[in-house]
């Protein structure tokens, strides 16, 4: 056997080159046949009407033919025949790769609530061979479950991702990325997660700046509530007591002028949206007016989120006392 060919792998729509090579040439005729055993070229003559086949080289030792705009139907065995006695035959297999036609990502719900599990599907249509689908949430790879459907030598792959969403996932892209031998570089599609979550409440003491509250001073607290959707209701209450008469409420701000010891207590900022409620407490302790140099103290604001039980860390501004942790039932 001195007739040689090489297998060819080509991407649909591109050009395949088929070469029939003769090692020891004796001027025998070389013929190229298609998978239906129809003659494509007999020496340098093409009887076949398919003009996508063009002669690249013809000599006694080689018949080289190009096939342009390759389609899936061109796949199969192509036969080189050498008219020696006995005749020799060798075949080359053309494998046609088809990149996925379409990449579609489908998310179960446009908006999810934190803690929910949502289903995300990604479909790579009509590829050959079957596409491998990889999932990423931001930069983190996730595991999906793929199903392959075959139709007419083409494969449609659907990958399902079950994703438990957290508030941190809001605005993070879920990326469906395909790996396929006919695709160079990154072929991907993405959808941004929209996660609704209950408010996170944080109390900021905006006055006094040094954080020590004394009789006769003023107090200004600002309630910062962040949630999705943005909380519509932000309210201040005094826990287990009435709000002081001289307290002024202005949106998220609480002003108390001319502090006195009867103002001592816990002040709560409550915020809610359609997902849920949350609050944060501030424990006010009013000190005596200064006589000499005031002792150094620190005051920290405290934040809680509602679950069945919220642990509130309360740090008192009383000199010499440690902050204590109390369980607060709601």
């Amino acid at each position: 056997q001195n007739l040689f060919t090489k297998d060819v792998t080509v991407i649909e729509g591109e050009v395949a080159t088929i070469s029939c090579q003769v090692n020891k040439s004796d001027d025998s005729v070389i013929q190229l046949l298609n998978p239906n055993r129809q003659t494509i070229y007999f020496r340098d003559f093409r009887p076949l009407k398919d003009s996508r086949f063009q002669l690249l080289n013809f000599s006694s030792s080689e018949l080289k033919v190009s096939l342009t705009n390759v389609s899936i139907s061109d796949e199969g065995r192509y036969f080189c025949q050498l008219y020696t006695d006995p005749p020799q035959e060798s075949y080359t297999t053309i494998t046609v790769l088809v990149p996925p036609r379409n990449l579609m990502i489908d998310i179960q719900r446009d908006t999810a609530v934190e803690g929910e599990e949502i289903e995300v599907n990604c479909t790579a249509m009509a590829s050959k061979p079957a596409t491998t689908i990889r999932w990423f949430k931001g930069n983190t790879e996730l595991k999906g479950k793929s199903e392959v459907e075959e139709w007419s030598d083409m494969y449609t792959v659907t990958s399902q991702l079950m994703l438990k969403v957290h508030k941190e996932d809001d605005g993070v892209p879920v990326i469906c990325q395909v790996e396929h031998p006919a695709v160079t570089g990154n072929l991907q599609t993405q959808r941004y997660l929209e996660v609704q979550y209950k408010p996170q409440v944080h109390i900021q003491m905006t006055y006094p700046l040094q954080g020590l509250t004394r009789e006769g001073d003023a107090l200004e607290l600002t309630c910062e509530a962040i949630g999705k959707p943005q909380p519509v209701m932000v309210t201040w209450v005094r826990v287990d007591d009435e709000m002081p008469q001289h307290a002024v409420l202005s949106g998220p701000n609480l002003f108390i002028n001319n502090l006195n010891k009867t103002d001592n207590g816990t002040y709560r900022c409550e915020a809610s949206n359609i997902v849920g409620k949350a609050h944060s407490d501030y424990m006010l302790y009013v000190y005596d007016p200064p006589t000499t140099i005031p002792p150094p103290t620190t005051t920290t604001t405290t934040t809680t989120t509602t679950t069945t039980t919220i642990l509130t860390i309360i740090t008192d501004s009383r000199a010499g006392e440690e902050g204590s942790i109390r369980a607060v039932d709601h």
Partner: antibody, heavy 119, light 109 residues
Framework: EVQLVESGGGLVQPGGSLRLSCAAS????????MSWVRQAPGKGLEWVSG????????YYADSVKGRFTISRDNSNNTLYLQMHSLRAEDTALYYC????????????WGQGTTVTVSR | SSELTQDPAVSVASGQTVRITCQGD??????PSWYQQKPRQAPVLVFF???NRPSGIPDRFSGSASGNTASLTIAGAQAEDDADYYC???????????FGGGTKVTVLG
């Protein structure tokens, strides 16, 4: 000058045998596929048989398969058609033809030899 | 078995154009060869493949093919073109050759 000359035709009884010859000259005989084509009186052309340049591949029309054998002697530049079990419908003028590209494009033809199958 | 179908006869005035057609399944895949045969003479190859005219054949002979039909056109027919014309093609995927029934072209002078 490229030339093909047929011989061997004649009158033969049904069931009889005959061998046709075609002498080629003026070209490299072994490089070409050769064919036999016949034409019944007043009728059109009918391809009968073909053989590759080396003689390794042979082809036949359904009407003669199993009865006719094509062969060639490249050293003597001669093409043959051995015909057995002849029938009245085999009566025709038999042409020898050179295939320019395999059996495609028969570019050189002989003048033909007549075979008559009759009682 | 496949076959090639030709119109039995066609006539053309001298200097006019005549088109001879050939129909058959094998022509979906292959270009035909066209042969001219004058009375008591051997056939002569006049056109083959996509666009091949053997040397010595006048350029008034041309061929075309589409679908399962092929045509031989004689543009400006001459008296010497009066002859029978046969189309020929490989029979589908088989190593057998077909001839059409022939078309008798009469050039009216």
């Amino acid at each position: 000058e490229v030339q093909l000359v047929e011989s061997g035709g004649g009158l033969v009884q049904p069931g009889g045998s005959l061998r046709l010859s075609c002498a080629a000259s003026g070209f490299t005989f072994r490089s070409y596929t050769m064919s036999w084509v016949r034409q019944a009186p007043g009728k059109g052309l009918e391809w009968v048989s073909g053989i590759s340049g080396s003689g390794g591949s042979t082809y036949y029309a359904d009407s003669v398969k199993g009865r006719f054998t094509i062969s060639r002697d490249n050293s003597n530049n001669t093409l043959y058609l051995q015909m057995h079990s002849l029938r009245a419908e085999d009566t025709a003028l038999y042409y020898c033809a050179r295939g320019l590209y395999g059996l495609y494009a028969m570019d050189v033809w002989g003048q033909g030899t007549t075979v008559t199958v009759s009682r | 078995s496949s076959e090639l179908t030709q119109d039995p006869a066609v006539s053309v005035a001298s200097g006019q154009t005549v088109r001879i057609t050939c129909q058959g399944d094998s022509l979906r895949h292959y270009y035909p060869s066209w042969y001219q045969q004058k009375p008591r003479q051997a056939p002569v190859l006049v056109f083959f493949g996509e666009n091949n005219r053997p040397s010595g054949i006048p350029d008034r002979f041309s061929g075309s093919a589409s679908g399962n039909t092929a045509s031989l056109t004689i543009a400006g027919a001459q008296a010497e073109d009066d002859a029978d014309y046969y189309c020929s093609s490989r029979d589908g995927n088989d190593d057998r050759w077909l001839f059409g029934g022939g078309t008798k072209v009469t050039v009216l002078g």
